[in-house]
Structure formats: C-alpha cells, structure tokens
Interface confidence: medium
Amino acid sequence: QNSQLQEELRGLRETFSNFTASTEAQVKGLSTQGGNVGRKMKSLESQLEKQQKDLSEDHSSLLLHVKQFVSDLRSLSCQMAALQGNGSERTCCPVNWVEHERSCYWFSRSGKAWADADNYCRLEDAHLVVVTSWEEQKFVQHHIGPVNTWMGLHDQNGPWKWVDGTDYETGFKNWRPEQPDDWYGHGLGGGEDCAHFTDDGRWNDDVCQRPYRWVCETELDKASQEPPLL
C-alpha cells in the first residue's frame, strides 16, 4: 500500500512538474507577447504623434498660405479697382510692397549710394523711409535684419532733414550713442551726412557714397478704404 502511495505521489509530482513547466512556458509566452504588444503600442503611439505633428505643421502651413492668398487676393482686387477707377488715388500697395499702418514699404536687396537710393524711391513715386515712431522703427528693423540700410534722413545742406518734410527736431530719433558725429576720419573726403539703420537697428551717420541697402515708403491715401474681396 505504501509503495502504491509512493507511486501515486511520484505520478502527482510528475504531473505537477509538467503543469508547472507548461504554465511557465505559457507565462513566458504571454510576457513575450505582452512585450511585443507594448512595443507595437509604443510604435503606434509614436506614429500617431508624428502624424499629429505633421498634420499640425500642414495646418499651420495651410493657414499661412490661406492668409497669403487672402492678402494677395485683396491686393489684386485693390489693384483692379484702382485700374478701373480714375487711378489718381493710391488705395493699396503695389505688388511686392508691404503694407503697414496705411503706408507701403519696399525693401531693397542690393546696395546703392544714398542719393541713388533716394532717386530710386522717387522714381517709384515714393521716398526713402521716414521713421516717425518706435512702432515703425520696430517694423522696419524686423524686415531689414542686421544690415546697414539707408533711411530718408540727411544733413547735406546743414541741419538734419527728413526727405518728406517731417520735422526732425520734434520727431522720433533712435541714434546710437555718440551719434551723429559727422566723422571725418574715414579718409573718403568730407564728413558723414546721411543716416542709416545699423546692425542693431539704431541710427548712425555715414558717408553718403557707401552702397547700403535702402527702404522706400509711400503713403496710402487717407480716405481710402480696403476694398471688399471679389
């Protein structure tokens, strides 16, 4: 009887051992699967995140394009209205010019002496930019970046003068410290009679012959309203 019990016990141990091994194998399998699922989930998550990011970027880009399209459409619509009307009023900015606070600005990408830049603007029925406020200064600075750029301010005939007649004495000024200094030490003959934006946006007087970039400005007519979109 004892030997029979021992036989049964051995059988049970064997069965239990098989069961344990089988269970362990299943657990191992499940944990591997779980790992795979986890990895798969992580991969899906990152894919989803990337798609979301791409979608968000596409959306931003599309918004920019739509904004630009609306702006172009408004500009073209205005140009057409101007061409259909008597045309003596400037109701919108010419193509390639930037509108800001009822003025149009054009930013050169090449260099000219001050007088040539002044002439260039006048040949566009405009003038070199006249800065009348800190707000306008920031706007221009944003567009020109850290590059020496002529403005419509000079003292070639004595006192400092804005090209459009804006009063210099009572107006906005943003000179660099110690400027204007009418420096003669450059060896180019004469002093410095023309004002320009420096790399930090503040103003300096320099030799008018230097080939700096420039900004043209023309004012939109006061009474004009933005035309409706077509």
Epitope: A82, L83, Q84, G85, N86, G87, S88, R90, P94, V95, N96, W97, W106, S110, K112, D116, N119, Y120, R122, L123, E124, D125, C216
Partner: antibody, heavy 122, light 107 residues
Framework: EVQLVQSGAEVKKPGSSVKVSCKAS????????INWVRQAPGQGLEWMGE????????FYAQKFQGRVTITADKSTSTAYMELSSLRSEDTAVYYC???????????????WGQGTTVTVSS | DIQMTQSPSSLSASVGDRVTITCRIS??????LAWYQQKPGKAPKLLIY???NLAEGVPSRFSGSGSGTDFTLTISSLQPEDFATYYC?????????FGQGTKLEIK
Amino acid sequence: EVQLVQSGAEVKKPGSSVKVSCKASGYTFTAYGINWVRQAPGQGLEWMGEIFPRSDSTFYAQKFQGRVTITADKSTSTAYMELSSLRSEDTAVYYCARKGREYGTSHYFDYWGQGTTVTVSS
Amino acid sequence: DIQMTQSPSSLSASVGDRVTITCRISENIYSNLAWYQQKPGKAPKLLIYAAINLAEGVPSRFSGSGSGTDFTLTISSLQPEDFATYYCQHFWGTPFTFGQGTKLEIK
C-alpha cells in the same frame, strides 16, 4: 488696348520752343510713368525725362535740365514735352513711352508712341 | 552716369544663324536691364525686361541672360523679320541710358 498717340510733325526755327503731346488710352493714366526719348537721324536712342502723372513728380536728364519741361494733364490723360531754345542738333524723332509697372523689380518701356518728327531749321 | 557699351555695333548674319549681342555696364546694375528691337521708321519694341524675362508676344527664339555688369541678348535662329537694330537700356537710377545700338543686317 493700350495706346499712346503723339501730335504731328513740327518745323521750328532755332531759338524757338516746341511742345509735343502724347495722349494715353486703354489704361489708368495716373498709374504709370510717362517717359520721353528722342532719336536724331541715323543715331541711337536718348532718354530725356519722366513724369509721374499721379504726383506730377518729374525727372530730367542732366543734358536737358533747364531746357525741357514735362507736364501731364490728368483730365485728358495727356503728357506733354516742351523743349526750348531749339538748335539744329535738336532735329530728331521724339517718342513718349510708358514705363512698365513692376514695382520693386526692374522697369521697362512697354508701350511707345508712334513718334513725332521735329525739324529745327532756319 | 552709368556707361553702356554695346557690341558689336553692326553684324551680318544669315537666316537660321544664332546671334549674340552683348551689353557691358560700367557698374553693377543687378538685373535692371531691358532689350528693344527697332525697325526703320518705327518706334522701339520691348523684347526682354529684367535682363531675362521675355516680353508679352515676343517669340521664344529671343532670350536674355546676365546680371551685374555683363548682359547678352541671343536670337537662337534668325528669321527674316529679325533684321533690325537692337538696343539695351539700364534702369538703375536716372538717366535711363541706352546702349549705342547693334544693327543686324542680312549677309
């Protein structure tokens, strides 16, 4: 259709003045600059000056400064070029030309008048 | 003032030839140059603006190249109606000077 139609031929005495007209049609007159260019017999083209009818701003070549006056009449869409103290060397065909409106890029003369012959002879 | 040197002043060529006219400028004018064609007794006609752009209605055998101080007008295959005088003109500030002209004649 854009057109620039100039006045007829003129014969003038030395020392006198001539006034040539250029009537524009087919576009908004005040939206473009009008330029004047002359060509002496068998010679090349010579730029004389420009007017912006919108603002009446004018620009003249140094050579003609003080002798040439360019004006514009918005009501009739007509530009005028008057040249005074005429001499025989002023005998030429005088053209008006519209300056193409490519703001902030390059300019060009896209439409020209048919030309006006001015003969200066005693 | 800006000086314009156009060359050659005259040239003889045959129908079908490729012809090149050059315009050299005394200073950098970037792309501010136009080319015109003029036939006897007629007003000049715009061919090329901004150095490389073909004006409306101008055949594609005409092309412009260059920027800065050296510019070229090329006619790829001469047609009988192309025999005329050609002028370059700069627009880099006044005066808007023209080149001296190139007379293109039949060989």
